[in-house]
Interface confidence: medium
């Protein structure tokens, strides 16, 4: 129930200069970049740009269900998976599909989340346990960041406000402050 | 750089009540939970209880139900947690922690990625 | 409450040596509530490894963990002299929260 199958709607993001969150661990460490071959340029010739406009990725909607043991969201929830590779504008079209992929031979630039957002989930739990409300980050945009060789693992597992984590904040719904409501929460928490 | 930075050490009288700061860093305190939690001199961790930063919402260990109060000021960024009717046996260092949330291969985990430097509270007459 | 109980509470090793340690959960708890922390004297916990596997942030190869339902381990193949610390178990399957009660790992 993790990761769903993606729907073929790519978009071309032309990504902002600035700062730049890290990717996400799972990206680094279980996930090969789908790379392809040079698309024809000479390697040098993009890469040589300061321009970090002049590059793009994709956002890939896909769609999956927040789980917590055997508690699953009533409704599944759509987020954007940012693709690994980042290239000039140009050579991305807009269609999966069309046009050949840039394999840089330079600085590698990578598609990672920007923007998130909070959407608030039920998570509906099977025996007759109450259900519980989750706060999930949603990655909701994407751009591209030039990684060098200084971007060491640790580096790339830095979670800060922006970070690329997929979720944050395990968040239940909004409860009574008694005593008494307390311990009922205690006891029915999961 | 993301942290949790708390305030300094305390010394309190028997009764006294105290209350102990943590300021986020770097990141938006209304996305994730902070947690306390409790070190008394030469022993282990003990949690006390969390709080919701975005509505204030609270949960806490039932033997601390009357012990502590948290409550947040989302405006600096600040968790505090006040702790009353002061004994010897709350001499303790106290952490705040973040709660993360990490969604990976299908699978979500929970568990505190960051936590604060503690504060050392010294009940003594 | 769940107890959270850990195995040994000390243990004296040298550098290089092979070193486990086992936490025992009072109930069953599923893999991905289980975590690990590495505490050094007079500071922080610094989050080890979560769901019973899963190495954090900047956290060496040499550590490890498995386990599941009761039972759950943390091994350290290779102690090097910076892991000498106390390390300790915690569970989020229920509230309250807990911890074990931490096992001392100190130079032979």
């Known amino acids: 129930q993790g990761w769903q199958a993606f729907k073929n709607d790519a978009t071309e993001i032309i990504p902002e200069l600035g700062e730049y969150p890290e990717p996400p661990p799972e990206l680094e460490n279980n996930k090969t970049m789908n790379r392809a071959e040079n698309g024809g340029r000479p390697p040098h010739h993009p890469f040589e740009t300061k321009d970090v406009s002049e590059y793009s990725c994709r956002e890939l909607h896909f769609t999956r269900y927040v789980t917590d043991g055997p508690c699953r969201s009533a409704k599944p929830v759509t987020e954007l998976v940012c693709s690994g590779q980042c290239g000039p504008a140009r050579l991305l079209p807009n269609a999966i599909g069309r046009g050949k992929w840039w394999r840089p031979s330079g600085p590698d630039f990578r598609c990672i989340p920007d923007r998130y957002r909070a959407q608030r989930v039920q998570l509906l739990c099977p025996g007759g346990e109450a259900p519980r409300a989750r706060k999930v980050r949603l990655v909701a945009s994407c751009k591209c960041k030039r990684l060098t060789r200084f971007h060491n693992q640790s580096e790339l597992k830095d979670f800060g406000t922006e970070a690329a984590r997929p979720q944050k904040g395990r968040k239940p719904r909004p409860r009574a402050r008694s005593a008494k409501a307390n311990q009922a929460e205690l006891e029915n928490a999961y | 750089e993301v942290q949790l930075v708390q305030s300094g050490a305390e010394v309190k009288k028997p009764g006294a009540s105290v209350k102990v700061s943590c300021k986020a860093s770097?990141?938006?305190?209304?996305?994730?939970?902070l947690h306390w939690v409790r070190q008394a001199p030469g022993q282990g961790l003990e949690w006390i209880g969390r709080?919701?930063?975005?509505?204030?919402?609270?949960l806490y260990d039932p033997k601390f139900q009357d012990k502590v109060t948290m409550t947040t000021d989302t405006s600096t960024s600040t968790a505090y947690m006040e702790l009353r009717s002061l004994r010897s046996d709350d001499t303790a260092v106290y952490y705040c922690?973040?709660?993360?949330?990490?969604?990976?291969?299908?699978?979500?985990?929970?568990?505190?990625?960051?936590w604060g430097r503690g504060t050392l509270v010294t009940v003594s007459s | 409450d769940i107890q959270m109980t850990q195995s040994p509470s000390s243990l004296s090793a040298s550098v290089g040596d092979r070193v486990t340690i086992t936490c025992s959960v009072s109930?069953?708890?599923?893999?991905?509530?289980l975590h690990w922390f590495q505490q050094k004297p007079g500071k922080a916990p610094k989050s080890l490894i979560y769901?019973?596997?899963n190495l954090a942030s900047g956290v060496p190869s040499r550590f490890s963990g498995s386990g599941s339902g009761t039972d759950f381990t943390l091994t350290i193949s290779s102690l090097q002299p910076e892991d000498f610390a106390t390390y300790y178990c915690?569970?989020?399957?229920?509230?309250?929260?807990?911890f074990g009660g931490g096992t001392k790992v100190e130079i032979k």
């Open positions: 922690a973040r709660e993360a949330d990490y969604f990976h291969d299908g699978t979500s985990y929970w568990y505190f990625d960051v």
């Open positions: 770097d990141f938006n305190i209304k996305d994730f939970y």
């Open positions: 709080i919701d930063p975005e509505n204030g919402d609270t």
């Open positions: 109930s069953t708890i599923s893999s991905n509530h």
């Open positions: 769901g019973t596997s």
């Open positions: 915690q569970q989020w399957s229920s509230y309250p929260l807990t």
